[in-house]
């Protein structure tokens, strides 16, 4: 009898009530492997979850998070709320980054600004809650009389030709 069940393909279950005939999974259920004695109930993507892939007879539904949330955990088992750039999610909700830290994403924690002086550089552009500082040449490079074999090219956005 066990051999009969092992012949049941994915998308079916071995129905003990019907002499171990392979019966198709009922609506809203699936079996992803052969030889199953029951079909599993499909996952429902409700609330802050939305359906990324519908359930089929051979595979479970896959969920995503609605706008304003992002996935956490295996197979998007949880949705965590987004915060604005310049904020981090704390136990009491979204809070602005403290001075000296930044977050340029809608998730994750605020990180300290880069310490330019550790690399012997100076701050070219100050940091904000949303952006890290931009480090420039070292103060020595900027002092009068400092020799430079090739002066630095003006900064330009990638893909733009010089004027």
């Amino acid at each position: 009898l066990q051999d009969l069940c092992s012949n049941c393909p994915a998308g079916t279950f071995c129905d003990n009530n019907r002499s171990q005939i392979c019966s198709p999974c009922p609506p809203n259920s699936f079996s992803s492997a052969g030889g199953q004695r029951t079909c599993d109930i499909c996952r429902q993507c409700k609330g802050v979850f939305k359906t990324r892939k519908e359930c089929s007879s051979t595979s479970n539904a896959e969920c995503d998070c609605i706008s304003g949330y992002h996935c956490l955990g295996a197979e998007c088992s949880m949705c965590e709320q987004d915060c604005k750039q310049g904020q981090e999610l704390t136990k009491k909700g979204c809070k602005d980054c403290c001075f000296g830290t930044f977050n340029d994403q809608k998730r994750g924690i605020c990180r300290p600004w880069t310490n330019c002086s550790l690399d012997g550089k100076s701050v070219l552009v100050n940091g904000t809650k949303e952006r890290d500082v931009v480090c420039g040449p070292s103060p020595a490079d900027l002092s009068p009389g400092a020799s430079s074999a090739t002066p630095p090219a003006p900064a330009r956005e990638p893909g733009h030709s010089p004027q």
């Epitope: 609330g47 802050v48 949330y69 956490l72 949880m78 949705c79 965590e80 709320q81 136990k91 009491k92 909700g93 979204c94």
Partner: antibody, heavy 121, light 112 residues
Amino acid sequence: QVQLQQSGPELVKPGASVKISCKTSGYAFSTSWMNWVKQRPGQGLEWIGRIYPGDGDTDYNGRFKGKATLTADKSSSTAYLQLSSLTSVDSAVYFCARLDGYYEVFYFDYWGQGTTLTVSS
Amino acid sequence: DVVMTQTPLTLSVTIGQPASISCKSSQSLLYSNGKTYLNWLLQRPGQSPKRLIYLVSKLDSGVPDRFTGSGSGTDFTLKISRVEAEDLGIYYCFQGTHFPWTFGGGTKLEIK
């Protein structure tokens, strides 16, 4: 799966104190707020307060300040509600309710089965 | 404290018929982040409360689609399109916008 198992019924004398426990499993205890809710017989629900087990931070309903004390033991994933100077109006069912910070920080998703407290001489 | 007023106190409904419960708050439940923390819970006889809806209209996992939540500001509604026997119990609205968080007085749904 998430489970909240509360301690059994309590019969205590007026003026005494009681400590109700809520043992949890199936989720990250330290990083989810645990709430306590009171329900008097045949009446509605009243929020007592909440505790963040990670650092012991608490928020109380002003009505329960001095009456209720919330604590948590991270090593056993257990939250506690202590009620002091008990009178008959404290007789009620007390629920622990997990707050799931993964969606928001403001709603209940799992509840304990409730602990019945009877204050009587 | 924010007072949550539910109406009616009792609702007697025939199975298969619709039902509607109102919940009014004494001040707006719109939080500073643009979200409204209004939930609906059901307490079946002898059981713990169970969340049905959060953020006004988001259905909890496993809650049938016959339940819908709507509203904004201070006026909110829970609707059941076709009442079933398992729906009987006491329905509570709950606000988590303002401390202390508060519940409505409850609406008892009875089956005719």
